[in-house]
């Protein structure tokens, strides 16, 4: 596959991944109440996200509300907010870096420097995927740990929400897309990080006697 095709495919995957990450960040479905206790008088589902939580009553009536205060949130939600937003912003920066290094743009003159810019964009997307993966896995670990913790009351047990799965899919796309962008940059000029301009010196003129300098012979 040509480097341009790798570049386009990589960028498309990264853009879809970025969109997925924004969706995961905004959705109030990072954790969803687990139905384990059939004795609960009124069945209701609680969804919790990074910015708000929603309650769906048995009647189907749903109410969502943004959290009252950042302080009222647990440390892991605060950390997840910070890391996810950082990943979204980093992906935005990576987009401009990738476009600047793309073969179809003229922001940077074609050559090794342009390939290095494209490679940087790919690496940024890879890092962006890893950055987003941290809160997703940390959050999932807490939810699963509390689910199996016998000291946690049944009414407080949660299951993994749809936003986590969307987030994981998004990080996979960002990382695969980042790898493809790196590969595209690599193929483009052949190891752009190693391609430095080589200086060739002109052959030396013969001396007055017509002899060549001994240093010119190996």
């Amino acid at each position: 596959m040509g480097s341009a095709a790798l570049e386009i495919l990589g960028l498309v995957l990264c853009l879809v991944g970025w969109g997925g990450l924004i969706l995961a960040c905004g959705l109030p479905m990072w954790q969803v109440t687990a139905f384990l206790d059939h004795n609960i008088v009124t069945a209701q589902t609680t969804w919790k996200g990074l910015w708000m939580s929603c309650v769906v009553q048995s009647t189907g009536h749903m109410q969502c509300k943004v959290y009252d205060s950042v302080l009222a949130l647990s440390t892991e939600v605060q950390a997840a907010r910070a890391l996810t937003v950082s990943a979204v912003l980093l992906a935005f920066v990576a987009l401009f870096v990738t476009l600047a290094g793309a073969q179809c743009t003229t922001c940077v003159a074609p050559g090794p420097a342009k390939a290095r810019v494209a490679l940087t964009g790919g690496v940024l997307y890879l890092f962006c995927g890893l950055l987003a993966l941290v809160p997703l896995c940390w959050f999932a670990n807490i939810v699963v740990r509390e689910f199996y913790d016998p000291s946690v009351p049944v009414s407080q047990k949660y299951e993994l929400g749809a936003a986590l799965y969307i987030g994981w899919a998004a990080t996979a796309l960002l990382m695969v897309g980042g790898c493809l962008l790196c590969c595209g940059a690599w193929v483009c000029t052949g190891r752009p990080d190693l391609s430095f301009p080589v200086k060739y010196s002109a052959p030396r003129r013969p001396t007055a006697t017509g002899d060549y300098d001994k240093k010119n012979y190996v």
Epitope: K48, L71, A72, P153
Partner: antibody, heavy 117, light 107 residues
Framework: QVQLKQSGPGLVQPSQSLSITCTVS????????VHWVRQSPGKGLEWLGV???????DYNGAFKSRLSISKDNSKSQVFFKMNSLQADDTAIYYC????????????WGTGTSVTVS | DIVMTQSHKFMSTSVGDRVSITCKAS??????VAWYQQKPGQSPTLLIY???TRHTGVPDRFTGSGSGTDYTLTISSVQAEDLALYYC?????????FGAGTKLELR
Amino acid sequence: QVQLKQSGPGLVQPSQSLSITCTVSGFSLIRYGVHWVRQSPGKGLEWLGVKWSGGSTDYNGAFKSRLSISKDNSKSQVFFKMNSLQADDTAIYYCARGLDGYYVPDVWGTGTSVTVS
Amino acid sequence: DIVMTQSHKFMSTSVGDRVSITCKASQDVSTNVAWYQQKPGQSPTLLIYWASTRHTGVPDRFTGSGSGTDYTLTISSVQAEDLALYYCQQHYSTPLTFGAGTKLELR
């Protein structure tokens, strides 16, 4: 089961300080905040302050100068201290878990009846 | 501070009746209102938050409604165990403030 058990003196001398310990079970102080509310016949329910899961504290301005709330996550304990008590501080003092993300005390402790005399 | 006013200190009712307890905030609290029930010698228990969302395990005969400054707790069919003190609370801003309470008693 979510529980908040309180321990503290029933009788306090005027101008002395009040210390109450709230020991929680069924949830972690790393994940939930703990509110302090008092109830007196004259003034009804009064919110005093909250110790958030992250460690920061919010106080009711009317009590800020003489109130201190701290916690020990490892021991699942929250400590309440109020200085310079007067007769009108006679009340039942409650600790209550905060609803995750909101200024709503959802599960209340047993309460500590305090008489200033 | 936001003042929460419960106009009725006492409300008389009979088992099976529908009863509504009202609460008025001194300013718009945009549905950030909670309702508590307190039985004699017990701690308050949360019934409703966000003005209309029932807390886990609360029977569906308890419903909350309202917006802006006016809020209502309705018990569709009063049971003997519902005879208690009811408090409203705003969770719009700190300091959190409570109403003076409404005591529900048998007629």
